[in-house]
């Protein structure tokens, strides 16, 4: 069973001092929501017993294996069902505590009732404050039964449940009609899945005979021991004030376990700690009684004395639960109550015995759960004991269960059962996960779900280049940390696999499935510098750069140009996908903007060092385009252009720029300035005869404006080849008059 205890502090004078603590003795309990152990959960369960809403309860985690619930403001906050959930995977277990109001009309004589399948359960509600109304019994919040208030027997209302079955388990309550539900008596009924002394799927297996009030678990046959007892059969008492499956926990406070209720996994339920009894666990056991709830009687023989925590304390020469066994009878010594081995291992098990006459090697035997008897291979004889060593054949899963060491001499016999847990080494169900990669290293998360048993003691990461036949490299890591694989080759695929191990010999599991992880390209190391830039318009910028000359091939796929607009907090990135490029035209920029510009080389996804930045100011946007541009040939070398001024000008025009290009020509266009902005006409001279030309123009204020429409016109006749166009401008009206 899972080592999980829910403690309720029952000193109820002040609800604000009330607390519930859930303690787990499981390895790695409550560490967090990863594959290595989900957290402990402690909460009030309002599904059956609903209480008025109040301030939220406070949950505090004390280390990894303990969680405490506080913040109860009034007594009604305490009434109801609380649960703690702990353990991982199939071992996830819920422990339940039911709290009754001490001022309720009806109080349970006993809150937890654990019964066997087919038994008759009797729930007894004691009258604390009488009401002359019907008594309503509910099961898990639903109506179950009614008793007339005259049906009380000795001040108690009894609910008899004959032939109970596991589905009958749950929370029962007895309430007077017309009374507050918080005044109910609440009970917890636990019905084991088997008849008395049996366990297993078909209830075919025999329980180990749990001592001291321990309860045999119907699924795994283990004894769930009362608080204060340990061992496979709960045969051993803990020191006063200690609890947990290995007596590893200590009751808080100076008065030990007084005033505490202990709730353990089903089918145990709840009880006071060893040595205490009463509804608030504050009364010490009466003489002759001991154990949880003081339910056990000592009945010590041969001068033994009764200790309320541990039972009979025997004088020398005697042992046994009631000091009924003479020390002449052989006795198994210090046998561990539970042993754990890994599957397919061949462990050695030791069993020591003493007695008079002295046990010899042949008088000690080991019996497996299937009845096979092993004889010891060697024995170590010491003055006070004989230790027999048994070599166990290769373990299989069926070897899990109760083994027995038995000693027989002419003085009598003794046997000790102990639990052997055969654990399956863990095998990863998934491949490790790549977190980050660089050119020479991979950062890997080895945390994966696994089949088999935990806890995980070590994680081995095996890796080698893909399609390689070389030996695997191995790195051993802490289970909870990410792993960095170093000194790898750039741009190389690696096959990576996880191998998990659990404690003990043979705890290494099979390797998990492989995954391919690829290192990044080498980082580009060259730093470019900006050669220059020039503005080609209010929103266009041509940039050029250089790289230092180095021997060998260029490590890079292209360049990244970055323009940072500090005013708007915006970055523009331009990808130049050729590593040979040394110039780029940036378009669609914001006119009148101050940009910070730099360039860097990239390779795969990695960026090299950025060039020193340059600061560029784009001119503001210019005026709208001139309107109604018209071209008219005047001669074999002259064409007159006329236009109208742009509309909605933001300021006075400083000049016009005319673009002249031979139609169908491949050469660059010629730009001609018209420096008298008031004019609306100009004559372009020095053109070639009988040649078709394209014209467009734009105005300039602080920056150049939009281009007008393009017009076409041909020069006249077959004149001489001109030297090239020039212009002469006039007001349009004047030109037309000539």
């Amino acid at each position: 069973a899972v080592d999980l205890t829910l403690l309720a502090n029952l000193r109820l004078t002040d609800p604000q001092r009330f607390f519930l603590t859930c303690v787990s003795g499981e390895a790695g309990a409550g560490r967090g929501s990863d594959a290595w152990g989900p957290p402990l959960l402690l909460e009030k369960d309002d599904r059956i017993v609903r209480t008025p809403p109040g301030p939220p309860l406070r949950l505090a985690r004390n280390g990894s294996h303990q969680v405490t619930l506080r913040g109860f403001s009034k007594p009604s906050d305490l009434v109801g069902v609380f649960s703690c959930v702990g353990g991982a995977g199939a071992r996830r277990t819920r422990v339940i505590y039911v709290h009754n109001s001490p001022g309720a009309h009806l109080l349970p004589d006993k809150v937890t009732h654990t019964v066997n399948k087919g038994d008759t359960a009797v729930l007894s509600a004691r009258v604390h404050k009488e009401k002359q109304t019907d008594v309503i019994w509910k099961s898990n919040g639903s109506y179950f039964y009614t008793l007339d208030w005259h049906e009380a027997q000795d001040g108690r209302f009894l609910l008899q449940l004959p032939n109970v079955q596991p589905p009958s388990s749950g929370i029962y309550s007895a309430t007077y009609l017309e009374a507050s539900p918080l005044g109910s008596a609440f009970f917890r009924l636990i019905v084991r899945g088997c008849g008395a002394g049996r366990w297993g799927p078909g209830c075919t297996k025999e329980c180990p005979g749990c001592l001291h009030g321990g309860v045999c678990h119907d699924h795994d046959g283990e004894c769930v021991c009362p608080p204060g007892f340990t061992g496979t059969r709960c045969e051993q008492a803990c020191r006063e004030g200690r609890f947990g499956q290995s007596c590893q926990e200590q009751c808080p406070g100076i008065s030990g376990c007084r005033g505490l209720t202990f709730c353990l996994p089903d089918p145990y339920g709840c009880s006071c700690g060893s040595g205490w009894r009463g509804s608030q666990c504050q009364e010490a056991c009466a003489p002759g009684h001991f154990g949880a709830d003081c339910r056990l009687q000592c009945q010590c023989q041969n001068g033994g004395t009764c200790d309320r925590f541990s039972g009979c304390v025997c004088p020398s020469g005697w042992h046994g639960v009631h000091c009924e066994k003479s020390d002449r009878i052989p006795q198994i010594l210090n046998m561990a109550s539970e042993l754990e081995f890994n599957l397919e291992t061949m462990p050695r098990i030791n069993c020591a015995a003493a007695g008079n006459p002295f046990p010899v090697r042949g008088s000690i035997e080991l019996r497996k759960p299937d009845g096979t008897v092993l004889l010891s291979t060697k024995a170590i004889v010491e003055p006070e004991k004989t230790t027999a060593e048994f070599e166990v054949p290769r373990l299989v899963l069926a070897d899990s269960g109760f083994w027995e060491c038995r000693v027989s001499t002419s003085g009598g016999q003794d046997s000790r059962r102990f639990k052997v847990n055969v654990k399956v080494p863990p095998v990863p169900l998934a491949a490790p996960r790549l977190l980050t990669k660089q050119s020479r290293q991979l950062v890997v998360s080895p945390l994966v779900s696994f089949s088999g048993d935990g806890p995980i003691s070590t994680v081995r990461l095996h890796y080698r280049p893909q399609d390689s036949t070389m030996d695997w490299s191995t790195i051993v890591v802490d289970p909870s940390e990410n792993v960095t694989l170093m000194n790898l080759r750039p741009k190389t695929g690696y096959s990576v696999r996880v191998q998990l191990s659990r404690p003990g010999e043979g705890g290494e599991g099979a390797w998990g499935p492989p995954t391919l992880m690829t290192t990044d390209c080498p980082e580009p190391l060259l730093q470019p510098w900006l050669e220059g830039w020039h503005v080609e318009g209010t929103d266009r910028l041509r940039v050029s750069w250089s790289l230092p000359l180095v021997p060998g091939p260029l490590v890079g796929d292209g360049f990244l140009l970055r323009l940072w607009d500090g005013t708007r907090g915006q970055e523009r990135r331009e990808n130049v996908s050729s590593p040979q490029a040394r110039t780029a035209l940036l378009t669609g920029l914001t006119p009148g903007t101050h940009y910070q510009l730099d360039v860097q080389l990239y390779h795969c996804t990695l960026l090299g060092p950025a060039s020193p930045p340059a600061h560029v100011l784009l001119p503001p946007s210019g005026p709208p385009a001139p309107r109604h541009l018209h071209a008219q040939a005047l001669s074999d070398s002259e064409i007159q252009l006329t236009w109208k001024h742009p509309e909605a000008l933001p300021g006075p025009i400083s000049k016009y720029v005319v673009e002249v290009q031979v139609a169908g020509g491949a050469g660059d266009p010629l730009w001609i300035d018209v420096d008298r902005p008031e004019e609306t006409s100009t004559i372009i001279r020095g053109l070639n005869a009988s040649t078709r030309y394209l014209f467009r123009m734009r105005a300039s204020i602080q920056g150049l404006g939009d281009w007008s429409n393009t017009v076409e016109e041909s020069t006249l006749g077959n004149g001489l080849q001109a030297e090239g166009p020039v212009q002469e401008s006039r007001a349009a009206e004047e030109g037309l008059d000539q």
Partner: antibody, heavy 121, light 111 residues
């Protein structure tokens, strides 16, 4: 279907006896208190008797105490009313009904059709 | 045993609202418990549950029927009176004697 069905009524002479039955179906009969209620011709409803689920506890109206006995057989899902020393004033339609509880409340949610008992010479 | 007193008859026109009262005689019935229920009985038929716990309506019962309680008196109000509401109405209260006390009954007539 959840229902109650009374039977056993009829004509009987004063001082005579009659046994009424009420067969329950469609619900867990054994967990509910069961009640007999009667209604004399042209009169109101009168509570007669209650029997609790165990069958061991019963209550009666003063007008029938000592003459009527309520009982139940949970294995047969049947409620009974044994009526002895009948009087003319016992003439009525006898209904069986169940008492239910919801969030602690008590009321009659299910009624039979009734069976007529006539006491006359 | 306790007695629950109701008016012998109440009448109203269609669409009107009417109220039937139910007054207990002791703290052992209406005044002492919140468990007053109301039943409707048409001639020749078995009673039918209308209201329980003073104010709650079972599913299937029209929301024209509503219940209330003040001190030792419980009330049933029928709003928007309809012809099919013409019937006898009984209140009932839990009593610790184990008895279930019924009211004297009220005949409702729709004019």
């Amino acid at each position: 279907e959840v229902q109650l069905l009374e039977s056993g009524g009829g004509l009987v002479q004063p001082g005579g006896s009659l046994r009424l039955s009420c067969a329950a179906s469609g619900f867990t009969f054994s967990i509910y208190p069961m009640i007999w209620v009667r209604q004399a011709p042209g009169k109101g409803l009168e509570w007669v008797s209650v029997i609790y689920p165990s069958g061991g506890h019963t209550r009666y109206a003063d007008s029938v105490k000592g003459r009527f006995t309520i009982s139940r057989d949970n294995s047969k899902n049947t409620l009974y009313l044994q009526m002895n020393s009948l009087r003319a004033e016992d003439t009525a339609v006898y209904y069986c009904t169940r008492r239910v509880y919801s969030s602690g409340s008590a009321y009659f949610d299910l009624w039979g059709r009734g069976t007529l008992v006539t006491v006359s010479s | 045993q306790s007695v629950l007193t109701q008016p012998a008859s109440v009448s109203g026109s269609p669409g009107q609202s009417i109220t039937i009262s139910c007054t207990g005689t002791s703290s052992d019935d209406v005044g002492g418990y919140n468990y007053v229920s109301w039943y409707q009985q048409h001639p020749g038929k078995a009673p039918k549950l209308l209201i329980y716990d003073v104010i709650n309506r079972p599913s299937g019962v029209s929301n024209r029927f509503s219940g209330s309680k003040s001190g030792n008196t419980a009330s049933l109000t029928i709003s928007g009176l309809q012809a099919e509401d013409e019937a006898d109405y009984y209140c009932s209260s839990y009593a610790s004697s184990g008895a279930r006390v019924f009211g004297t009954g009220t005949k409702v007539t729709v004019l």
